[in-house]
């Protein structure tokens, strides 16, 4: 039975040209996390694998940085970065947990972050 829950940064906004930290946190399970995938719609941004470490997709290597922790940092944001982002936790024996973040990239300085999210 899957007992875990994923907390995320939720709905967030940022300014064009700026950067944003995407963060998820899996709790309430003792399952072993074997891999975390970060995806934008159907595109793979990055993977953190327990045995192999981090891999950033080549098409994003200039704009994506690993961390903080198992999170992901997106830089040089464009309005095309607006959309859904998913953190996908592959665990054993529970299976897959998925968290969703919606990012809106704004042209002007009206960007406002959603609820503040702190890793314990």
């Amino acid at each position: 039975m899957m007992t875990g829950t994923i907390e995320t940064t939720g709905n967030i906004s940022a300014e064009k040209g700026g950067s944003i930290i995407l963060q998820c946190h899996l709790s309430s399970t003792t399952a072993q996390v074997t891999q975390v995938n970060w995806e934008q719609q159907d595109q793979l941004l990055a993977i953190c694998n327990a045995d192999l470490g981090w891999h950033i997709s080549p098409s994003f290597k200039d704009r994506v940085a690993p961390g903080p922790g198992l999170g992901l940092t997106l830089q040089s944001l464009t309005v095309n970065d607006t959309g859904e982002y998913f953190c996908i936790y592959h665990t054993y024996p529970d299976g897959t947990y998925t968290g969703r973040i919606f990012l809106e990239v704004l042209e002007s300085s009206v960007a406002e972050h959603g609820a503040r999210f702190q890793i314990p």
Epitope: Q32, T34, G53, G67, G69, I119
Partner: nanobody, 120 residues
Framework: EVQLVESGGGLVQPGGSLRLSCAAS????????MGWFRQAPGKEREFVST????????YYADSVKGRFTISADNSKNTAYLQMNSLKPEDTAVYYC?????????????WGQGTLVTVSS
Amino acid sequence: EVQLVESGGGLVQPGGSLRLSCAASGTFQRINAMGWFRQAPGKEREFVSTINWSGSNTYYADSVKGRFTISADNSKNTAYLQMNSLKPEDTAVYYCASSYSSSSGLGDIWGQGTLVTVSS
């Protein structure tokens, strides 16, 4: 349990330098990435720099490129952030964060933070 210990913060004049260090200790098999993030009073936590342990790829925020250099000593499980040409706007609490692998899978951890004040 994995722990991060940060050191090297302090008061420095504009144009000066500081070197931060972040050391991981505890029970883990490998560090996957380690990096620095900062938070100024009343502002969101922001990305500064990270280093990918596998491949030693380094990543920097645009605001610190050319001034800050991140490096790692794998044998000591320690990352360093050399900060040169410091500006008053670099004043913040600097947090270290890391992703790691252990016998229980992937995990991540934050340090307690070290204060950097740039002022004349």
